[in-house]
């Protein structure tokens, strides 16, 4: 009956952690004697190829300084405890502690048997490092040039993490990779770039980080912050301002970042009706007269700049009763 070595084609271990490289001789055959078990690294330099051996009488040996005896152990293999007990070598699973990047590579588990001869199996050990992720908005001021408005950083991953963005905005990503402080790891930085305008302020975009150490992608929401001058509009005019009307109000509606620091009401004609009283963002009209046949201007200031809006007012002689709505304001 033929025997075979059962190994995993690939084993993944966490950088700094412990990994087991399973190796079993199957099936159990009466009279099949395992005289030696060895683990080798065929791709390593000659003086580092022999990693571990298990001799039925002498037990385990770990000759190579890399990984070295302090980081290696046989999980189940047992040497003969006396002259009358057999060694148990069918399970040659090797544990590797304190994984380093240099541990990555091919490992050959070999059973020297009698009478079947030598049989072996090979495992590829991959050393991975789970990255630490963070994302943050960059405080930017509106401009005509593409600017980084958010950063997503995946620190010290192995292999490098894959970063993408989820957003309905018109954007592009710029990625950089640098070596992590832990040898063999990579820090990936993705810059979410767009032409910063008020439309982007307060919008939430999502950084998506994918890595084989994650069960599912990491999704990190980021709320953008764009400083921009006030964007102004005027509401409250209902096309039914008539002489003597007393309940009219204009509101200066503003989107801005940061908050407005001042409101200024004026007219294009240069004359300002005395019955119109500015109260911050509102213009309260006590009584509409003919001077209201003008264009009102609301100018709003913030730390970035200023914005303005105009509203043309047409004063009627009498109320418009044909479907006119309630008064604005």
């Amino acid at each position: 009956q033929d025997v075979r070595v059962q190994v995993l084609p690939e084993v993944r271990g966490q950088l700094g952690g412990t990994v087991e490289l399973p190796c079993h001789l199957l099936p159990p055959v009466p009279g099949l004697y395992i005289s030696l078990v060895t683990w080798q690294r065929p791709d390593a330099p000659a003086n580092h190829q022999n990693v571990a051996a298990f001799h039925p009488k002498m037990g385990p040996s770990f000759p190579s300084p890399k990984p070295g005896s302090e980081r290696l152990s046989f999980v189940s293999a047992k040497q003969s405890t006396g002259q009358d007990t057999e060694a148990e070598l069918q399970d040659a699973t090797l544990a590797l502690h304190g994984l380093t990047v240099e541990d990555e590579g091919n490992y050959t588990c070999e059973f020297a048997t009698f009478p079947k001869g030598s049989v072996r199996g090979m495992t590829w050990l991959r050393v991975i490092a789970k990255p630490k992720n963070q994302a943050e908005a960059q405080k930017v001021t509106f401009s005509q040039d593409p600017t980084t408005v958010a950063l997503c950083i995946s620190k010290e991953g192995r292999p490098p993490a894959r970063i993408s963005w989820l957003s309905s905005l018109d954007w592009e990503a710029k990625e950089t990779q640098v070596s992590g402080t832990l040898a063999g790891t990579v820090t990936v930085t993705s810059r979410f770039t767009l032409v910063p305008s008020g439309r982007a302020d307060g919008v939430t975009v999502t950084c998506k980080v994918e890595h084989e150490s994650f069960e599912e992608p990491a999704l990190i929401p980021v709320t953008l912050s764009v400083r921009y001058p006030p964007e102004v509009s005027i509401s409250g005019y209902d096309d039914n301002w008539y002489l003597g009307r007393t309940d009219a109000t204009l509101s200066c509606d503003v989107r801005s970042n940061p908050e407005p620091t001042g409101y200024d009401w004026s007219t294009t004609s240069g004359t300002f009706p005395t019955s119109a009283v500015a109260q911050g963002s509102q213009l309260v009209i006590h009584a509409v007269d003919s001077l209201f046949n003008t264009t009102f201007v609301c100018t709003v200031t913030n730390a970035v700049g200023m914005g303005r809006a105009e509203q043309v007012i047409f004063v009627r002689e009498t109320p418009n009763t044909a479907g006119a709505g309630a008064t604005g304001g």
Epitope: G31, P56, D84, F114, G117, S118
Partner: antibody
Framework: EVQLVQSGAEVKKPGSSVKVSCKAS????????IHWVRQPPGKGLEWIGA????????NYNQKFKARATITAVTSTSTAYMELSSLRSEDTAVYYC?????????WGQGTTVTVSS | DIVMTQSPSTLSASVGDRVSVTCKAS??????VVWYQQKPGQPPKTLIY???YRYSGVPDRFTGSGSGTDFTLTISSLQAEDLAEYFC?????????FGQGTKLEIK
């Protein structure tokens, strides 16, 4: 302590047979193969074959398969190697040996001289 | 069968010398090679197993190296008690085969 004690020296005529014994002690006899290796005077070592006392399975070097018979008697913990049709080039020291990783335990050797 | 060709057949050296014995396999045997030392009138004793692993109690002046088809036993500083014959043996494939031996003489 593991011990392998072999039978005494033999002088044989060409064409005859010789049977060498190897009495084992100090371990479970049925759990380990007993191998036979020979060494002609001033020459190297040559593996003849082995027996597994647990099920009497045997395994031979093809060179000796037609002439060698290796057996084991569990009741006495003794292994035997019989070589037939002896010729002068079979003159050698014959060792029984126990494989524990390597050939770790050896009998003291039995000198077989084939001479007319 | 795998042929193990050992050289030299005789080696004469002085105490303190560094000496090497080589063994060439006729086909790849991995690291499945043992080195034995045999003193006159005694059975062989294991020095090195799996090509480079020193057996228990063997002085560290004995080292083994090699893999595949080429193997070397080195004695870093020859001692008088090293007067013996040395054999390599492959256990990769049945039947086990031995080198023809290297007789080490002390000058």
């Amino acid at each position: 302590e593991v011990q392998l004690v072999q039978s005494g020296a033999e002088v044989k005529k060409p064409g005859s047979s010789v049977k060498v014994s190897c009495k084992a002690s100090g371990y479970i006899f049925t759990s380990y193969w007993i191998h036979w290796v020979r060494q002609p005077p001033g020459k190297g070592l040559e593996w003849i074959g082995a027996v597994y006392p647990g099920n009497s399975d045997s395994n031979y070097n093809q060179k000796f398969k037609a002439r060698a018979t290796i057996t084991a008697v569990t009741s006495t913990s003794t292994a035997y190697m019989e070589l037939s049709s002896l010729r002068s080039e079979d003159t050698a020291v014959y060792y029984c040996t126990k494989l524990v990783g390597t050939f770790d335990y050896w009998g003291q050797g039995t000198t077989v001289t084939v001479s007319s | 069968d795998i042929v193990m060709t050992q050289s030299p057949s005789t080696l004469s050296a002085s105490v303190g010398d560094r000496v090497s014995v080589t063994c060439k396999a006729s086909q790849n045997v991995g690291i499945n090679v043992v080195w034995y030392q045999q003193k006159p009138g005694q059975p062989p004793k294991t020095l090195i197993y799996s090509a480079s692993y020193r057996y228990s109690g063997v002085p560290d002046r004995f080292t083994g190296s090699g893999s595949g088809t080429d193997f070397t036993l080195t004695i870093s500083s020859l001692q008088a008690e090293d007067l013996a014959e040395y054999f390599c043996q492959q256990y990769n494939t049945n039947p086990f085969t031995f080198g023809q031996g290297t007789k080490l003489e002390i000058k």
